[in-house]
Interface confidence: medium
């Protein structure tokens, strides 16, 4: 599923991401935009043999199990395919674990490069939340 901007903002808010670990909803929507272009079925392969999955591009070396990433830790204890569902529950729950890990949203390269320090509230402007 490819979410609309405000549709995703509303779904993320319902799942408790607004101000989770101090990150406003705009940060999460911005991250999703530049990680996956709001596409729940996005997959991207990395040079280390791991793959990033879903709307928040969660990595198989650390967070989920895709059955083929050497040394996978599967810290979210889920199959990576669950992160590709049109229901973003699994991605949100895993993202909460990632953002609580110590580096905050710096774990997402796209957030660090495209969202951090910008007017992230613009990503939820005009949305009925």
């Amino acid at each position: 599923k490819v979410f609309g901007r405000c549709e995703l903002a509303a779904a993320m808010k319902r799942h408790g991401l607004d101000n989770y670990r101090g990150y406003s909803l705009g940060n999460w929507v911005c991250a999703a935009k530049f990680e996956s272009n709001f596409n729940t079925q996005a997959t991207n392969r990395n040079t280390d043999g791991s793959t990033d999955y879903g709307i928040l591009q969660i990595n198989s070396r650390w967070w989920c199990n895709d059955g083929r990433t050497p040394g996978s830790r599967n810290l979210c204890n889920i199959p990576c395919s669950a992160l590709l569902s049109s229901d973003i529950t699994a991605s949100v729950n895993c993202a909460k674990k990632i953002v609580s890990d110590g580096n905050g949203m710096n774990a997402w390269v796209a957030w660090r490069n495209r969202c951090k320090g910008t007017d992230v509230q613009a990503w939820i402007r005009g949305c009925r939340l």
Partner: antibody, heavy 116, light 107 residues
């Protein structure tokens, strides 16, 4: 136990298309990548590409882009590979395998013969 | 693409001999190297994964070693059922690639 069952041998004319199937049993089909591999005598094994059935995400070896198309039906636990514009170079045995980085589980292979 | 070169192309041995098969990668692939056996008209069978880890049900006479770019499959005291083709495969990057194979034949 995990099994991959491929469709039977095919004889096709040049220019035609063929669709090979790979039915998976014994595991959660949507969760694992299915890989496709080509084997021609004297050419060894060639990786064609892969599909993740749960999402339909696909990756292709550049060499096979435009030649192979992968699909999957999660209701029947079956992956498909369509080969188009067939030539004699496409005559080969085609395998599906479960994509665990290494391939422990393989189908029995589908022999494709392209001949006028 | 990563190229895998296997040598020798053919190895003629007598049952009971011990042999080593080589696989060389065109660039470092860490430990992401796997070995397969294939007999005529059969699907490949995984022998060794990640350089040295034995696959389920594989006899202990098969072992693997190496790192980086140079890898070896060793068979200690070859048995008649071991004759066939052997392929290496890398999973360090895409596209996945296989070596050209080594044919193990009876002398």
């Amino acid at each position: 136990q995990v099994q991959l069952q491929e469709s039977g041998a095919e004889v096709m004319k040049p220019g035609a298309s063929v669709k090979i199937s790979c039915k998976a049993t014994g595991y959660t089909f949507s969760t694992y990548w299915i890989e496709w591999v080509k084997q021609r005598p004297g050419h060894g094994l060639e990786w064609i590409g892969e599909i993740l059935p749960g999402s339909g995400s696909t990756y292709y070896n550049e060499k096979f882009k435009g030649k192979a198309t992968f699909t999957a039906d999660t209701s029947s636990n079956t992956a498909y590979m369509q080969l188009s514009s067939l030539t004699s170079e496409d005559s080969a045995v085609y395998y599906c395998a479960r994509g665990d980085g290494n391939y422990y589980y393989w189908g029995q292979g589908t022999t494709l013969t392209v001949s006028s | 693409d990563i190229e895998l070169t296997q040598s020798p192309a053919t190895l003629s041995v007598t049952p009971g001999d011990s042999v080593s098969l080589s696989c060389r990668a065109s660039q470092s692939i860490s430990n992401n190297l796997h070995w397969y056996q294939q007999k005529s008209h059969e699907s490949p069978r995984l022998l060794i994964k990640y350089v040295s880890q034995s696959s389920s049900g594989i006899p202990s006479r098969f072992s693997g070693s190496g790192s980086g770019t140079d890898f070896t499959l060793s068979i200690n005291s070859v048995e008649t059922e071991d004759f066939g083709m052997y392929f290496c495969q890398q999973s360090n990057s895409w596209p996945r690639t296989f070596g050209g194979g080594t044919k193990l034949e009876i002398k």
